[in-house]
Interface confidence: low
Amino acid sequence: DAHKSEVAHRFKDLGEENFKALVLIAFAQYLQQCPFEDHVKLVNEVTEFAKTCVADESAENCDKSLHTLFGDKLCTVATLRETYGEMADCCAKQEPERNECFLQHKDDNPNLPRLVRPEVDVMCTAFHDNEETFLKKYLYEIARRHPYFYAPELLFFAKRYKAAFTECCQAADKAACLLPKLDELRDEGKASSAKQRLKCASLQKFGERAFKAWAVARLSQRFPKAEFAEVSKLVTDLTKVHTECCHGDLLECADDRADLAKYICENQDSISSKLKECCEKPLLEKSHCIAEVENDEMPADLPSLAADFVESKDVCKNYAEAKDVFLGMFLYEYARRHPDYSVVLLLRLAKTYETTLEKCCAAADPHECYAKVFDEFKPLVEEPQNLIKQNCELFEQLGEYKFQNALLVRYTKKVPQVSTPTLVEVSRNLGKVGSKCCKHPEAKRMPCAEDYLSVVLNQLCVLHEKTPVSDRVTKCCTESLVNRRPCFSALEVDETYVPKEFNAETFTFHADICTLSEKERQIKKQTALVELVKHKPKATKEQLKAVMDDFAAFVEKCCKADDKETCFAEEGKKLVAASQAALGL
């Protein structure tokens, strides 16, 4: 239904608080370097304007699209050219090109200072002094660092953030109450951001069809009792929501997500038996809960897939009449029967099925040609199963830190051109698959592990896209969304790589390492490990282990010394010399 004023429509639907929060998120995700105060000012102006449109939808400019209104507002920032360089050229374009231009300039790795957590008392004072500004700052800081964060979900995080401070700032031991909650929000937030980044990459790089295929598979696993028509409706609506959020249309996205949650809850009897608790919650919690809901039980008497998709004489006829619908039904039927498969595996199977039908339906005897199609699935299923089995065994043997180190070495050898911080970040996250998924029983391991790895490898892909340095990374990232993980797994040591010149400065450490948290200390050591591999790509596991053990002992020794700085200087020189000797540098 067309509204005279889109901005008034969204303001009324969302309410002032959510409207302001979403506009702040949108602006911070576009102009990631702008100061908080500037964004607040812009948001206040937009909000005041929206109120004039609510009062009179025919008022001047109220009929303009949200992109026009928001784009005009962003283009008034005086320092656009100095701060953002060529992004300022977007302002010379007309909609919709201007918004596309802004989207292209979103930076997945903005040059922003690390968020340092102040003392608990300082945070609680700030929270009590001005709760509204405190929460706005949270939205702003997360949004500008995560320009694709799922906006309605960020409202949910902000609500939990507020609840944590409300509860803990009046607790006897504020820190014991608050810090674990903030750690949990931080970790969940990073995971949520990365998951949404994959959805946006899927839509933007591989198109709506790829996203819809992913959604059919995932929703069919989650709601196996729902009929295909119901799943298709949910997929269409979900695709609209994510297309809007990934496109910067956050007000529409949040509004449509709320409508989708409402629809799901009104129709839960025909969707899933697991939704009851979710649907009793308030809106933000309800939407989050639905998105995370466990898979419903599979219907008991599902017939064999072969009847409709292999044995039937009508396979080619059905395929020819409506290819995507028929493939969608195949994916739906396969996925609802296989909650034990990863979504990406299901999509590989569907792709194999499609390729086989394309070939066979043009053959002299189509049925003879595609009769053995399910046999082709066997190696596709076994490959991730074996990989997960091997890596979980390695994880259980080594523990998370050393497992991460093994992956660091593996991936640095595969793609040594990638920057050290990116290799450390991505390998650390790849290594977390162990503690996240290996504890699960066999039936849950693959969906946990392989779909998580897809999210992490997408981080590598988006970071690499910003400054491409490796043809191999580009190839694995762009050729096929569902085959990214097998593509990276198949990479061997890059024999073309010319080892990096040895630089002693890279391996010079100071006493400040002693005051770092365990996590930060690990990152320092892992950074050194990547650099070692870049210097000596052919180093054996044993050589690298010896050097890293020496390094750990060196840090431990100097951190216990009275004169730490002198120890780091003198022992450090010895360590570098010994390492060079050990590696034959």
Partner: antibody
Framework: QVQLKESGPGLVAPSQSLSITCTVS????????MTWVRQPPGKGLEWIGT?????NTNYANWAKGRFSISKDSTQVFLKMNSLQTDDTAMYYC????????????????WGQGTLVTVSS | DIVMTQSPSSLSASLGERVTITCQAS??????LAWYQQKPGKTPKLLIF???TVASGVPSRFKGSGSGTEFSLTISSLQPEDFATYYC????????????FGGGTKLEIK
């Protein structure tokens, strides 16, 4: 460099008309609303009127009818009719902070002002 | 029309002192209020907008607060360069007369 510069004849006889000009540089009038403010000697600031990015005008009640604001691509004009001695003042042009949909914002950039004296 | 009433109209204070100037709007203007500083023979300078947001380059000793009809400007510790005249100004979107200035407060050295 972003700046505003007012100019115009300083002395005018009572009941006469006068135009003063504000020349802008370093930004576009299609992005910012422009406002005229005056300050009689030893007195406070008085808002005269504003011209929006789209060229619409808005005046203080006391200024309606006698004062009119217009603009071209780089200049903003204030035309004053039937001037009286109590119109003697320093006349400033000022730019809004950012374009706002209703074109009313704080005044973040001011010209140096031009003194208009109405005297016989 | 909105009328802005500023008080006091003049004020004497010493270096290092904390001073507060108030401004009252005849009807609610939300947070749409700015504060300016003007020194003799000089152009006005923006200090605060949206009632409490400090303009860039303005020292942190200047603090604005309030919303609706009651607003204040506080200077936490007077410096020699702060002796000037201060004006509040509303910018109301819904009003046909968009802007209204207060009468000014002259801050003098004691």
């Amino acid at each position: 460099q972003v700046q505003l510069k007012e100019s115009g004849p300083g002395l005018v006889a009572p009941s006469q008309s006068l135009s003063i000009t504000c020349t802008v540089s370093g930004f576009s009038l299609s992005r910012y609303a422009m406002t005229w403010v005056r300050q009689p000697p030893g007195k406070g600031l008085e808002w005269i009127g504003t011209i929006t990015t789209g060229g619409n005008t808005n005046y203080a009640n006391w200024a309606k009818g006698r004062f009119s604001i217009s603009k071209d691509s780089t200049q903003v004009f204030l035309k004053m009719n039937s001037l009286q001695t109590d119109d003697t003042a320093m006349y400033y042009c000022a730019r809004g902070g950012y374009v706002s949909y209703a074109d009313a914002t704080e005044l973040s950039l001011w010209g140096q002002g031009t003194l208009v004296t109405v005297s016989s | 029309d909105i009328v802005m009433t500023q008080s006091p109209s003049s004020l004497s204070a010493s270096l290092g002192e904390r001073v507060t100037i108030t401004c009252q709007a005849s009807q609610s203007i939300g947070s749409r209020l700015a504060w300016y500083q003007q020194k003799p023979g000089k152009t006005p300078k923006l200090l605060i907008f949206y009632a409490s947001t400090v303009a860039s380059g303005v020292p942190s000793r200047f603090k604005g607060s309030g919303s609706g009809t009651e607003f204040s400007l506080t200077i936490s510790s007077l410096q020699p360069e702060d002796f000037a005249t201060y004006y509040c100004q509303s910018y109301d979107y819904s009003s046909s007369s968009s802007y209204a200035f207060g009468g000014g407060t002259k801050l003098e050295i004691k």
